[in-house]
């Protein structure tokens, strides 16, 4: 049977401190750079193997990362917001969103947020 | 997952000149970070050159010799090798990870990167 994918969308407050390689992440994304369709959001495209982010735990691939130290990322070109993580300092807060697929039921809208397209 | 297929390679004459394209898979390539590597008979695998979104980087020993470049359109990264000299011959290597580091270092660790082609040989004589 055909279903559709739903998501729950959550965000959550996470605190890095910078290891000696850094934050162990990659990101795709900027109004350059769209990764998601309509969106020019920062996005978590790889969690490197025993970083800082890795060894936190909670930061994922495919999470949008809202916010760094405050500072709002919408609206950035890819290599600026690169560059603001790059500067950001030794203790990091990020704001990030979270999607988590949570059913598949019968065929039918989209579900809310759904970046496929 | 994204596959890396490489192709140009061969023997050449010191002071001559090779082409290398790697062309991979994916939707997204315009974001990936590309890279080539070489490993020569009894050595350790070395970067080379590595094209991100912003800039190419190349290691001393190939710079002002080696160009990298890419074509989004074709999915597809080269290694321009230019006054080729006997110490470059070795087997290239192309690798790809999705996305830019937010780290600062640069980009020629090879655990940087999750994707890597079977490598095509290069023979300088």
């Known amino acids: 049977m055909n279903g559709r994918v739903d998501y729950l969308v959550t965000e959550e407050e996470i605190n890095l401190t910078r290891g000696p390689s850094g934050l162990g992440f990659n990101i795709v994304g900027g109004t350059d750079q769209q990764y998601v369709s309509n969106d020019s959001g920062i996005y978590v495209s790889r969690i490197k193997e025993n970083g800082a982010a890795a060894l936190d735990g909670r930061l994922q691939e495919g999470d949008k990362i809202l916010s760094v130290n405050g500072q709002d990322l919408k609206n950035l070109l890819h290599q600026d917001a690169v560059d603001l993580f790059r500067n950001a300092g030794y203790a990091v807060s990020l704001r990030v969103q979270h999607r988590l697929q949570v059913q598949n039921g019968p065929i039918g809208h989209r579900g809310e947020g759904d970046p496929s397209g | 997952d994204v596959q890396l297929v490489e192709s140009g390679g061969g023997s050449v004459q010191a002071g001559g000149s090779l082409r290398l394209s790697c062309t991979a898979s994916g939707r997204t390539f315009s974001t990936y970070t590309m890279a080539w590597f070489r490993q020569a008979p009894g050595k350790e695998r070395e970067f080379v050159a590595a094209?991100?979104?912003?800039?190419?980087y190349y290691a001393d020993s190939v710079t002002g010799r080696f160009t990298i470049s890419r074509d989004n359109a074709k999915n597809t990264v080269y290694l321009q090798m230019n006054s080729l000299k006997p110490e470059d011959t070795a087997v290239y290597y192309c690798a790809a990870v999705i996305g830019s580091t937010v780290d600062s270092y640069g980009p020629g660790d090879p655990l940087e990167y999750d994707y890597w082609g079977q490598g095509t040989q290069v023979t300088v004589s």
């Open positions: 094209i991100s979104w912003s800039g190419a």
